[in-house]
């Protein structure tokens, strides 16, 4: 009688997360009698996956009719595979006894799990920055396997080159994470711009995942001010306007000063939007010239998005 052999024909099996993995195992003899057990890993720390005779293993089903006479097929199917199931699985024949003793092991089948990366999450700087400044964006994606992955950055469809990417951990793992930081130089036209992080992985069948960040959440475009005097509207009254142009975001407070004294404060409300996403706003002040003996210095002072105030002044001549 030839001695029993345990045959695991597949050296490796690759399965997508969520699917079932079939691990093949046959024996060449019914003798000695004793159960087949499946383990993940080898040595004293190995994990029992299935015991033909003892215990309940809800995720495991036998592929063949295992309670059939002369059954020598002990292949199993493991349902709902996750990256944590990756490893080398051994089909082991035990000899019946008290307790059962290990008789012979198969060569092992390495199970690798193909897991999709999570949707990339792009985050920008905590504080807004102004044009000509360089800001950093980060992109993170987790839970993918195998380790090979490609990450690209785009700004408005144009690929960026100034970025650094790390995949962790460096060694073997059930799943991996990617972290990338890109540097972007802001321009005044970036209110409508988008930064895109694109992740390509074998599990995505050529359809990469994208994460986006709107530069509108990052950029601050400071306003330009222009103060002009309008023709006299009525006797003793002068209309002075303050044009606040090309600012973003909308949060803006304007204060009129007459000879350094606060005349009026208002908040930008009915703004007009430019094509590039910035805003314009205009405020005017009616000055009663007859109330002044001397020339009047009018100042338009603007506080934009919590930043230090900027101002523009206009000298109003009062004729004797």
């Amino acid at each position: 009688e030839e001695e029993l052999q345990v045959i695991q024909p597949d050296k490796s099996v690759s399965v997508a997360a969520g699917e079932s993995a079939i691990l093949h195992c046959t024996v060449t003899s019914l003798i000695p009698v004793g159960p087949i057990q499946w383990f993940r890993g080898a040595g004293p720390a190995r994990e029992l996956i299935y015991n033909q005779k003892e215990g309940h293993f809800p995720r495991v089903t036998t592929v063949s009719e295992s309670t059939k006479r002369e059954n020598m097929d002990f292949s199993i199917s493991i349902s709902n595979i996750t990256p944590a199931d990756a490893g080398t699985y051994y089909c082991v024949k035990f000899r019946k006894g008290s307790p059962d003793t290990e008789f012979k092991s198969g060569a092992g089948t390495e199970l690798s799990v193909r897991a999709k990366p999570s949707a990339p999450v792009v985050s920008g700087p905590a504080a807004r920055a102004t044009p000509q400044h360089t800001v950093s964006f980060t992109c993170e994606s987790h839970g993918f396997s195998p380790r090979d992955i490609t990450l690209k950055w785009f700004k408005n469809g144009n690929e960026l080159s100034d970025f650094q990417t790390n995949v962790d951990p460096v060694g073997e793992s059930v799943s991996y994470s990617i972290h990338s930081t890109a540097k972007v130089v802001l321009t005044r036209e970036d209110v409508h711009s988008q930064v895109i992080c694109e992740v390509a992985h074998v599990t995505l069948q050529g359809d990469p995942l994208r994460g986006t960040a709107n530069l509108s959440e990052t950029i601050r475009v400071p306003p330009t001010l222009e103060v002009t005097q309008q023709p006299v509207r009525a006797e003793n009254q002068v209309n002075v306007t303050c044009q606040v142009r090309k600012f973003y975001p909308q949060r803006l407070q304007l204060t009129w000063l007459e000879n350094g004294n606060v005349s009026r404060t208002e908040t930008a409300s009915t703004v007009t939007e430019n094509k590039d996403g910035t805003y314009n706003w205009m405020s005017w002040l009616l000055v009663n010239v007859s109330a002044h003996r001397d020339d009047v210095k009018l100042t338009c002072q603007v506080e934009h998005d919590g930043q230090p105030a900027v101002s523009k002044s206009h000298d109003l001549k009062v004729s004797a």
Epitope: T67, R69, E70
Partner: antibody, heavy 121, light 111 residues
């Protein structure tokens, strides 16, 4: 430690009914086929019935001498196997053993101590 | 049904000697190279105890002085050297097909 404990035997009149029970412990009951075998001085050891697993749809098989009169059943949640015996005859007298089939092959590796049924008027 | 005929019905063997029990089936109990024959030992007041499975394989915990052989329709149980505790009745049983049947038994006495 594997244990099989039968109960329910006793003295019955011909034509009567009786139910034998067997409680198992020390192993995963739901993974094993279970059998009843009886023994009498007249007939020696005689296989009576077999019940298979849930995955086998609890298939049952019977000796010709008891077919239609005896019913084997199991309750995996209680690790128990039963033998319902109707229309009892004198020749059903004997010790009834509850047995575990180790390898789906009438490999009777563990036997209970037995319960005695006497059918007599 | 497959009928199993055991012989002898009883035998007496001296301590340390060999006991040989035969079991003949009315039809082959062998398929695919496996011999579906089992041997049991029964002592008074106890249930039978499995000794040999698939004709020639020693059940776990059974002393090596018990051995089985045979194929097809003819099978043998050997006990050597016989010890006092081996005094019992021995049964063969087949699982070649349903229904499973047992031999009539062989009573072994130690001289």
């Amino acid at each position: 430690e594997v244990k099989l404990e039968e109960s329910g035997g006793g003295l019955m009149q011909p034509g009567g009914s009786m139910k034998l029970s067997c409680v198992a412990s020390g192993f995963t009951f739901s993974n094993y086929w279970m059998n009843w075998v009886r023994q009498s001085p007249e007939k020696g050891l005689e296989w009576v019935a077999e019940i298979r697993l849930k995955s086998n749809n609890y298939a049952t098989h019977y000796a010709e001498s008891v077919k239609g009169r005896f019913t084997i059943s199991r309750d995996d949640s209680k690790s128990s196997v039963y033998l319902q015996m109707n229309n009892l005859r004198a020749e059903d007298t004997g010790i009834y053993y509850c047995i575990r089939d180790y390898d789906y092959d009438a490999y009777f590796d563990y036997w209970g101590q037995g319960t005695t049924l006497t059918v007599s008027s | 049904d497959i009928v199993l005929t055991q012989s002898p019905a009883s035998l007496a063997v001296s301590l340390g000697q060999r006991a040989t029990i035969s079991c003949r089936a009315s039809k082959s109990v062998s398929t695919s190279g496996y011999n579906y024959m089992y041997w049991y030992q029964q002592k008074p007041g106890q249930p039978p105890k499995l000794l040999i499975y698939l004709a020639s394989n020693l059940e776990s915990g059974v002393p090596a002085r018990f051995s089985g052989s045979g194929s097809g329709t003819d099978f043998t149980l050997n006990i050597h050297p016989v010890e006092e505790e081996d005094a019992a009745t021995y049964y063969c049983q087949h699982s070649g097909e349903l229904p499973y049947t047992f031999g009539g038994g062989t009573k072994l006495e130690i001289k």
